[in-house]
């Protein structure tokens, strides 16, 4: 099938990094500067992505692969292939349309991104608060006083934090 296809379509012989140039009798021509083709048999080359503004170049464009961007310090990537950059906040804050805002009492964020999440409710597990929560840290739950027996001093770590629903990644 491949041999038949090659006979019918000379463009199928053009490798990645080239395009099938209709203006030159379907000769395989190299991709022009700032363009690429990642597969063979292409009739055009794609324009390279430019990483500008908040985006910085993680990988340069080549004739066979697109440039890859990441975000400048103080920002983080969002979306497939780092299609967006979102600004960081401090721990204990969340990003809103009014900028970075402190977590409300009873919530925390231990990262520079994402949303403030409620402190763990220790009493739901029949435990007591061993260490109070802050804007930056969840509470630490400990055994309830009734559970304390001589020699027992185990501390239960807080439940794993939920994934922030703030930033689709």
């Amino acid at each position: 099938f491949e041999r038949t296809r090659s006979l019918q379509d000379p463009c199928s012989n053009c490798p990645a990094g080239t395009f099938c140039d209709n203006n030159r009798n379907q000769i395989c021509s190299p991709c022009p500067p700032n363009s690429f083709s990642s597969a063979g048999g292409q009739r055009t080359c794609d324009i390279c992505r430019q990483c500008k503004g908040v985006f910085r170049t993680r990988k340069e464009c080549s004739s066979t692969s697109n440039a890859e961007c990441d975000c400048t310090p103080g920002f983080h990537c969002l979306g497939a292939g780092c299609s967006m950059c979102e600004q960081d906040c401090k721990q204990g804050q969340e990003l809103t349309k009014k900028g970075c805002k402190d977590c409300c009492f009873g919530t925390f964020n231990d990262q520079k991104r994402g949303i403030c999440r409620p402190w763990t409710n220790c009493s739901l597990d029949g435990k007591s608060v061993l260490v109070n929560g802050t804007k930056e840290r969840d509470v630490v739950c400990g055994p309830s006083p009734a559970d304390l027996s001589p020699g027992a001093s185990s501390v239960t770590p807080p439940a794993p934090a939920r994934e922030p629903g703030h930033s689709p990644q």
Epitope: V54, S83, M84, E86, S167
Partner: nanobody
Amino acid sequence: EVQLVESGGGLVQPGGSLRLSCGASGFTFSSYWMLWFRQAPGKGLEWVANINQDGSEKYYVDSVKGRFTISRDNAKNSLYLQMNTLRAEDTAIYYCARGGDGYSNSHFGTDVWGQGTTVTVSS
């Protein structure tokens, strides 16, 4: 091609005013939140202000509140930043940026940036 081009920067004395413009092309300008950021010499990028699609919501960083005004003209595909009572600490490169699809609902990411325009406040 999706593009943002800033203009209007320059040298101004403390207490003076400048109006920055940002022309948009290659996309439906009226469908997107728009933002201004700035980068002072030797510092990181700082969010300055943002505005929603129809201009009814505007937000500012505390340091420019009452001095800067963000606005837009969807008919002209243009974003503006009116800067009054300028201070030396406002010296920076100013960038306009487009809020990505879903901005303010699911994220606060930006996806298109201009090349920047330089504002210098000095006597």
